[in-house]
């Protein structure tokens, strides 16, 4: 798997999309996990609804939300209020039994807010030991939430 790079601005929301073949992964729940080191395990952050037919409902763990278009074949992860510590390597996974297939390897990069004048570097990336081989950059269009806007509306 090549690594796809998604860049977001600190304090804003970043949307990561992971396309997959809807028929090949029929009936499978999905997960978003964080890679702990280059050879380390992938630590589950959030997974889709326990009932697969309800995978379109947004599930959330802290500032990370996940939703799955099981028919169209797109898993979407939203990282809200992006922070420097969110930078790193992640995976979108398709779960079956105790196994997990990697749908996409993702590198999240956090850019400094251009309106923030703190004396800081403009890019947070993982440690130099982590591989950037075959990385494909995909800029994510994101925006700040409007005042009073509910980022993740409650699902009925």
């Amino acid at each position: 798997h090549n690594t796809t790079v998604f860049q977001g601005v600190e304090g804003q929301s970043l949307q990561v999309s992971c396309p997959y073949d809807s028929m090949k992964h029929w009936g499978r729940r999905k997960a978003w996990c964080r890679q702990l080191g280059e050879k380390g395990p992938c630590q589950r952050v959030v997974s889709t609804h326990n009932l697969w037919l309800l995978s379109f409902l947004r599930r959330r763990n802290g500032s990370t939300a996940i939703t799955d278009d099981t028919l169209g074949g797109t898993l979407t992860i939203t990282l809200r209020n992006l922070q420097p510590h969110d930078a790193g390597f992640y995976q979108c996974q398709s779960l079956h039994g105790s196994e997990a297939d990697t749908l996409r390897k993702v590198l999240v990069e956090v850019l400094a807010d251009p309106l923030d004048h703190r004396d800081a570097g403009d890019l947070w990336v993982p440690g130099e030991s982590e591989s950037f081989e075959d990385a494909h950059v995909e800029h994510s269009i994101s925006r700040s939430l409007l005042e009073g806007e509910i980022p993740f509306p409650p699902t009925s």
Partner: antibody
Framework: QVQLVQSGAEVKKPGASVKVSCKAS????????MSWVRQAPGQGLEWMGV????????VYAQKFQGRVTMTRDTSISTAYMELSRLRSEDTAVYYC????????????WGQGTLVTVSS | DIQMTQSPSSLSASVGDRVTITCRAS??????LAWYQQKPGKAPKLLIY???SLQSGVPSRFSGSGSGTDFTLTISSLQPEDFATYYC?????????FGQGTKVEIK
């Protein structure tokens, strides 16, 4: 027992639309996706699309994109398939078919609805 | 789209015969293959899913095998009610597609 009962045969003129219904019983309607498959006279099977009965989300085969609309009414456990701008090549038996979550195969089928398009 | 080619397109057999129908996919579909039986004027009936799993209620004389691009449906001892048309269906890649069918006739 699981049953999918479809509406009766239809005769339509070219350019018209047809709406076929599929009433489910014997299982929880919102627990399974519903698909539509058609079969022209003496021909093979052709997948048209699928609907999630909970969300109403749909995916259609490219061939039918823009002409087919799949909907559902969960209150009466019924799925619908509407095909517009009919042409003679659309003459076929239309089947609704249930899809379990463990495999993308069609485990129960409706009895079929013959749609004849003729001027 | 993936093309599914069944062979033969028709065959004649007698009750008690062992019958084999093959299905070839135009590209690798792993084991994402199903088999159906259809009788005239009736809806198809699911026999086998995931290449070799027998659908509930289907007689054990039906079996499926294969992986990748080549698959087989076997009827170990043909019964009078087995005379029908058989279709394979792949669902390893969207959109799902069917073979053209194999008609099993009485010899």
């Amino acid at each position: 027992q699981v049953q999918l009962v479809q509406s009766g045969a239809e005769v339509k003129k070219p350019g018209a639309s047809v709406k076929v219904s599929c009433k489910a019983s014997g299982y929880t309607f919102t627990g399974y996706h519903m698909s539509w498959v058609r079969q022209a006279p003496g021909q093979g099977l052709e997948w048209m699309g699928v609907i999630n009965p909970v969300s109403g989300n749909t995916v259609y085969a490219q061939k039918f994109q823009g002409r087919v609309t799949m909907t559902r009414d969960t209150s009466i456990s019924t799925a619908y398939m509407e095909l517009s701008r009919l042409r003679s090549e659309d003459t076929a038996v239309y089947y609704c078919a249930r899809i379990p979550s463990y495999t993308y195969a069609f485990d129960y089928w409706g009895q079929g609805t013959l749609v004849t398009v003729s001027s | 789209d993936i093309q599914m080619t069944q062979s033969p397109s028709s065959l004649s057999a007698s009750v008690g015969d062992r019958v084999t129908i093959t299905c070839r996919a135009s590209q690798d579909i792993s084991n994402y293959l199903a088999w159906y039986q259809q009788k005239p004027g009736k809806a198809p009936k699911l026999l086998i899913y995931r290449a070799s799993s027998l659908q509930s209620g289907v007689p054990s004389r039906f079996s499926g095998s294969g992986s990748g691009t080549d698959f087989t449906l076997t009827i170990s001892s043909l019964q009078p009610e087995d005379f029908a048309t058989y279709y394979c269906q792949q669902h390893g890649h969207s959109p799902t597609t069917f073979g053209q069918g194999t008609k099993v006739e009485i010899k």
